[in-house]
């Protein structure tokens, strides 16, 4: 893959480019400042850059106003003002407001509803396929084994707390130890971090609505990525995480507690329960070893159970295998000893749709899965409607200034930390950082909430799902509390290193620029969010667990050239920027790589000749399912109408930044890939029907 | 009520087999092992083998593996005991016994069959 | 092979005594020990299983205890049925092996 995807004609001086170019400004200057604006309409002017005298300035005209797409946009009011209405419209529109918060409520209710039947949905599809990764033994030598289980296990499971529940009762049981838990719980915070990108791929259908949308959501995979990056190692050199958990467990006398509110779940748990209830010990045991697991479904089936524990006598091979020597014993052929077993009696079924429906787990969590995306996406689709509804005018304004505004000088440093402190008491309110998250991406999609603002409140939600697990952790039993409570402040401390790593100094906040190059990229080529997903949460992750697998010799020797590569790609695109003249003339641009590996365009046309089929018309027959097909043909006027629709990318690909005789000054034709703008117009043009 | 009817006295010759039979009544043979013990005259116990009649699972005491074999014939309820290359130090009163269920344990004792090898 | 070891051989004994048998096991088998009683011209009898369990029909006067390598029969109040040969047995593997007997005759 390319450095930068972004670099398809690259200007012979490579660090003069356009404001707002994707990737092209790895010291682009933090946007916080600007969040105070909250009417945008001085879109900040296009900033040209002076080219060499070779170049002929005077072919440009008048620079046009190119808004920067990370601007929030305005929402412009086109009702009737309230002043204006006479009592009856006044009335109406009182009730119209009640209506749509009544709406907002209860499609917010189905989104959360939706994302925890999703959970089960995934745990369905790979759950014991999750649980069987963590029986590979290699993982106590391992930590990058480790960590890539951590990832998968979570991915699978849609859900941090399930595989980090599980490492914590194979740490009970001496399975594992914590040393080598810690780089499966850093592995479990970047898998959770799926959730919220899968929700920002709803938003697809609004170019610059996709674009703040994912780029809010990647934010938390970078941030999970660049901590794994450097706590990872740091961990494995220094133990650092082991020893201060260590330490503060050991030092307090921890009685049991009791266990963390379920706040969110109550209002929720009513409604996912007559969908499906799982049997998540069944995930857990297959990591255990637990042969007749294999075999068990984790639908639920029976929900009220008697359990009566009771001795009976079992055959051994020989006596080395009694449970006890007393309890030992032979009938004269074979041998004998006594076992305790638990004998569970069925009292009541549990009342869900799949009790009766005998179907293999598989066939559930397919059911399950393409529903429960249907419903989120849909549910996504009316909150972000009917917010983009009431979000209008002075209401937008109001709740812009109060999220986006910094304090005064000269507390504006202690902003950041009241959102982190937000996001973590949210996160602990609702119980789960995907459901914050979640919910949190379209807020950044329709331009409520600016990126900069989403980060650290995405910081505290990686805290305040640390903060349930430690409560969660007092609250275990005996022999489990040790563990489980140490496993959840190596969670904490991971989540607090990270946060010292990449907040405080805003030159060190990387994830959001990377986010927003990532957003600049998606936007543009839409189909490149799913491959980014696929990478990033299953092709790396498999590839390196299938390395670790063939022994670390091969992973090592694949993965130091692979290190090296990209470690020397980075040092090239940081000289480039930052002194290309240190360079030779032939290494400062990506001209002489071929064009497939500096830029996204051939790899689009291939995807464009995969889809060929939606490239022409895109079939927006639902407003659900045409997502689907606008980020596989990337038609430009998806979900405007219900019907059919012609795609005339092709026609606006021309407008530009006007130039008088681009045919003769090629050399500098300063291309859109290149900025990673889309006219605003792009994505809001009605579709013409067919 | 549990009964056990062992054959008559035999006399053999060294060399020779003796083959004892042991009628069971009175619970399902099947169920229960059989196990065999002989006592020479005058002397203790000493425990031969044991048969499963439901599988026809055997095990023997290391001393007579080779020597003894038990069978059984589930239709008429009866177990037998064949114990060949006789000794004269074989002379003992063969009894055959019912075990206790899984255990190790005799509850119910033939009456005993007098095998006396002499030349 | 575990080797059952009763003590004593033969013992005199009046009626309404109280009479002590035990046995000693060459290794630990738990508690997989039982008692016979056998009477002259008779087939053994089964007294005790489980080292203390009575076998159905069995008189309340006889109790086994122990466990590991040391057995104990206890007939706490001898009654002339009683006078016989006794035999400990373990049961923890094969081979099963007995006890050569303890022999209670009247004083």
């Known amino acids: 893959m390319a450095p930068w995807p972004e670099l398809g004609d690259a200007q012979p001086n490579p660090d003069k480019y356009l404001e707002g170019a994707a990737g092209q400004q790895p010291t682009a200057p933090d946007k916080s400042k600007e969040t105070n604006k909250t009417d945008n309409t001085e879109a900040p002017v296009t900033k040209i850059e002076l080219l060499p005298s070779y170049s002929t300035a005077t072919l440009i005209d008048e620079p046009t106003e190119v808004d920067d797409p990370w601007n929030l946009p305005t929402l412009q009011d086109s009702g009737i003002k309230w002043s204006e209405r006479d009592t009856k419209g006044k009335i109406l529109c009182f009730f119209q407001g009640i209506g749509r918060l009544i709406l907002l409520l209860g499609f917010l209710y189905f989104f959360v509803c939706s994302l925890d039947i999703l959970s089960s949905a995934f745990q369905l599809v790979g759950g014991k396929m999750a649980g069987q990764f963590f029986s590979n033994s290699s993982i106590m030598s391992n930590p990058l084994l480790g960590l890539v289980i951590g990832v998968l296990v979570t991915v699978l499971v849609q859900s941090s707390s399930t595989s980090t529940s599980i490492v914590v009762s194979m740490v009970s049981s001496s399975l594992l130890t914590v040393r080598a838990a810690i780089p499966i719980i850093m592995g479990a915070n970047i898998g959770t971090s799926i959730t919220n990108t899968i929700v920002a791929l709803m938003q697809v259908g609004d170019r610059s609505e996709f674009r703040r949308a994912f780029a809010g959501a990647t934010v938390h995979d970078f941030f999970n990525w660049l901590s794994v990056l450097v706590l990872l190692p740091v961990e494995v050199a220094t133990h650092y995480l082991e020893i201060i958990t260590q330490l503060i467990v050991e030092s307090f006398h921890f009685k049991n507690g009791e266990d963390a509110p379920d706040l969110l779940k109550v209002i929720t748990k009513p409604f996912t329960k007559l969908i499906v209830q799982l049997d998540k010990k069944v995930i857990s045991q297959i990591a255990m070893n637990d042969e007749k697991a294999k075999n068990k479904s984790l639908v639920k089936i029976w929900c009220k159970t008697f359990t009566n524990k009771t001795q009976i006598n079992v055959t051994v091979p020989s006596t080395a295998n009694c449970t006890s020597p007393s309890l030992c014993w032979t009938d004269g052929i074979q041998n004998w000893t006594m076992k305790n077993v638990t004998y569970k009696e069925n009292i009541a079924k549990c009342q869900h749709i799949f009790v009766n429906f005998h179907l293999p787990d598989l066939a559930v969590g397919t059911i399950l899965l393409i529903l429960s995306l249907l419903v989120l996406c849909g549910c996504l689709i009316m909150i972000v409607k009917i917010l983009g509804s009431v979000l209008k005018g002075q209401v937008a304004t109001v709740i812009k200034k109060t999220i986006n505004t910094d304090f005064p000088f000269p507390f504006a440093w202690l902003t950041g930390y009241l959102a982190i402190l937000v996001g973590a008491g949210m996160t602990f309110i609702v119980q789960s950082s995907s459901v914050f998250t979640s919910a949190l991406t379209p807020l950044i999609g329709i331009g409520v909430i600016t990126i900069e603002r989403a980060y650290p409140l995405t910081l505290g939600s990686n805290i305040g799902t640390t903060t349930t697990a430690i409560l969660a952790a007092l609250a275990s039993p005996g022999n489990a509390l040790r563990s489980s409570l140490q496993i959840a402040l190596c969670h904490f401390f991971f989540n607090i290193s990270g946060i010292l790593l990449w907040y405080p100094i805003p030159f060190t906040r990387l994830p959001i620029r990377m986010a927003k190059g990532l957003g600049n990229i998606s936007a543009k080529y839409r189909w490149f969010a799913v491959f980014y997903l696929i990478i990033f949460f299953f092709l790396i992750p498999l590839t390196v667990f299938g390395l670790s697998l063939a022994g670390w010799r091969v992973l090592v020797g694949v993965g130091v050239p692979v290190v090296f590569i990209i470690i020397l790609v980075l040092c090239l695109r940081l000289l480039q920027s930052r002194c290309p003249r240190v360079l030779p003339k032939k290494l400062q641009n990506w001209n002489f790589l071929p064009l497939w590996m500096r830029s996204l365009k051939p790899w689009d046309a291939v995807v464009s000749k995969f889809t060929g089929c939606f490239q022409m018309r895109c079939c927006c027959c639902c407003r659900v399912c045409c997502r689907a097909c606008c980020l596989l043909c990337d038609c430009p006027k998806c979900c405007r109408c219900s019907k059919c629709c012609e795609d005339l990318e092709e026609a606006q690909e021309g407008q530009d930044v006007p130039v008088k005789a681009p045919e003769t000054f090629d050399n500098i034709t300063i291309s859109r890939e290149a900025q990673g703008e889309v006219p605003a117009s792009d994505s809001k043009t009605e579709c013409t029907a067919l | 009520q549990v009964q056990l009817v062992e054959s008559g006295a035999e006399v053999k010759q060294p060399g020779e087999s003796v083959k004892v039979s042991c009628k069971a009544s009175?619970?399902?043979?099947?169920?229960?092992?059989m196990h065999w013990v002989r006592q020479a005259p005058g002397q203790g116990l000493e425990w031969m083998g044991a048969?499963?009649?439901?599988?026809?699972?055997?095990g023997y005491s290391q001393k007579f593996q080779g020597r003894v074999t038990l069978t059984v014939d589930k239709s008429a309820s009866t177990a037998y005991m064949e114990l060949s290359s006789l000794r004269s130090e074989d002379t003992a009163v063969y009894f055959c016994v019912r075990g206790g269920r899984g255990l190790g344990t005799m509850d119910y004792w033939g009456q005993g069959t007098l095998v006396t090898v002499s030349s | 092979d575990i080797q059952m070891t009763q003590s004593p051989s033969f013992l005199s004994a009046s009626v309404g005594d109280r009479v002590t048998i035990t046995c000693s096991a060459s290794q630990d088998v738990g508690s997989s020990v039982a008692w016979y009683q056998q009477k002259p011209g008779q087939s053994p009898k089964l007294l005790i299983y489980w080292a203390s369990t009575r076998h159905t029909g069995v008189p309340s006067r006889f109790s086994g205890s122990g466990s590991g390598t040391d057995f104990t029969l206890t007939i706490s109040s001898l009654q002339p049925e009683d006078f016989a040969t006794y035999y400990c047995q373990h049961y923890r593997n094969i081979p099963l092996t007995f006890g050569q007997g303890t022999k209670v005759e009247i004083k």
């Open positions: 048969i499963y009649p439901g599988s026809g699972n055997t």
């Open positions: 009175g619970y399902t043979f099947a169920s229960y092992n």
